[in-house]
């Protein structure tokens, strides 16, 4: 978790002097509770936006937006703590809006936004906005949270972001797999425009089961520049095991931008349809 382009972050708006600060996610009001605390945020919205860095890279960011309730507690609102928790790693990043002037009611509802938390493809986050000071231990909670799942790199809009392109999202191998005679598979795919090697991982399964009955790895050396964007054809020999008929072919590239951690593409060949065999008719009639 990180902030996009740690340049001057702004939270001021007409009628409010405000500064954005780094936060330890442990506001002072936890340790020194106050008697009077503001109410919770209203209408918290989390959206996926895309933002360019100063270097021109494009990143997915969490766009956080919320409004204030129209009650007198805004007189005691000193700021807000924005927290983003990545659920699979428990990593948390916080920033603090520090109000340098007192809020006053005005003709429009107060609205705040922040769009600088960089999020990763295919990750889930919990976003929390805490109004400050935080409540006394038994006080009503004054925060709002929402969970938010970022699409993976196969998503059309995510595909062109820098983290996805770095993991090979623009490569479409257009894999085809056909079954040949004599227990063989022909795998064909389009090479990318980079002199890097590939690996074909074959895993075979019985008809309706998920534990493998055969595994095989095939190395494809780095293509020459004249072979870029050409089709590569590989014939794989299968184990002659009856019923080991469902084959998953996975192609792993080793692009320089992602090395061992590039996006893999796969294709599956299903077991052939079994013809319905009629019940055999007994050649004698049972006597019961």
């Amino acid at each position: 978790l990180r902030l996009l382009d740690h340049r001057a972050l702004v939270c001021s708006q007409p009628g409010l002097n405000c500064t954005v600060k780094n936060s330890t996610c442990l506001d002072d009001s936890w340790i020194h509770p106050r008697n009077l605390t503001p109410s919770s945020p209203k209408d918290l919205q989390i959206q996926l936006h895309f933002a360019h860095t100063q270097q021109g890279d494009l990143f997915p960011v969490a766009h956080i937006e919320w409004t204030l309730q129209t009650d007198a507690s805004i007189l005691y609102l000193e700021g807000a703590e924005l927290s983003v928790l990545q659920l699979n790693t428990n990593e948390r990043l916080c920033v603090r809006f520090e109000f340098l002037s007192k809020l006053r009611h005005h003709h429009r509802r107060w609205r705040f936004t922040f769009s600088h938390f960089v999020v990763d493809p295919d990750q889930e986050y919990e976003v929390t906005v805490h109004h400050l000071p935080k409540p006394i231990p038994d006080g009503d909670p004054n925060h709002q949270s929402k969970n938010f799942l970022v699409p993976d790199c196969e998503h059309a809009r995510m595909k062109v972001t820098t983290p996805c392109m770095s993991s090979g999202s623009l490569w479409d191998p257009n894999i085809t797999v056909e079954t040949l005679e004599a227990h063989q598979l022909r795998v064909s795919f389009t090479l990318w425009n980079e002199s890097t090697h590939y690996q074909i991982l074959l895993t075979s399964f019985p008809h309706m089961e998920n534990h493998s009955c055969f595994e095989h790895m095939h190395h494809i050396p780095a293509p020459r520049p004249e072979e870029f964007h050409q089709r590569s054809n590989v014939t794989l020999t299968l184990r002659n095991l009856k019923g080991c008929c469902r084959h998953q072919v996975q192609i792993q590239p080793f692009f320089s931008s992602c090395l061992n951690d590039c996006l893999r593409h796969s294709a599956t060949v299903s077991c052939p349809e079994m013809p319905d065999t009629p019940e055999p008719i007994p050649d004698y009639m049972p006597l019961w």
């Epitope: 989390i46 959206q47 996926l48 799942l149 993976d152 196969e154 995510m158």
Partner: nanobody, 127 residues
């Protein structure tokens, strides 16, 4: 212009099944998470189920878990809700909803981030 048209509602006895459909147009359906929300007579909107842009992630409200199944067909720009073992308390107007953003709101407190565009389809469960 975004259009979401629900169908498949009707009057059904408790314990029976219904399948709701939603036909979407006017936006890139395969880029957005979709949801079903419902409104029982005299009540507010209640989130029922959601599905991520590619169907890789689904979620259900506690009252419908194990009975309802959400699915989508991106090639047909369609969203579905298979409702089994229907109960009287499932009686409501069911709406198909598009997530406003490209992400997927994966908690229960989501329905304020949706766009609802149609009149909904009425499901009445009664003996």
């Amino acid at each position: 212009e975004v259009q979401l048209v629900e169908s498949g509602g009707g009057l059904v006895q408790p314990g029976r099944s219904l399948r709701l459909s939603c036909a979407a147009s006017g936006f890139n359906f395969d880029e957005y998470a979709m949801h079903w929300v419902r409104q029982a007579p005299g009540k507010g909107l209640e989130w029922v189920s959601g599905i991520s842009w590619n169907g890789g992630r689904v979620g259900y409200a506690e009252p419908v878990k194990g009975r309802f199944t959400i699915s989508r067909d991106n090639a047909k720009n369609s969203l579905y809700l298979q409702m089994n073992s229907l109960r009287v308390e499932d009686t409501a107007l069911y709406y198909c909803a598009k997530e406003r953003s490209l992400g997927y709101c994966s908690g229960g407190s989501c329905s304020d981030g949706f766009d609802i565009w149609d009149q909904g389809t009425l499901v009445t469960v009664s003996s």
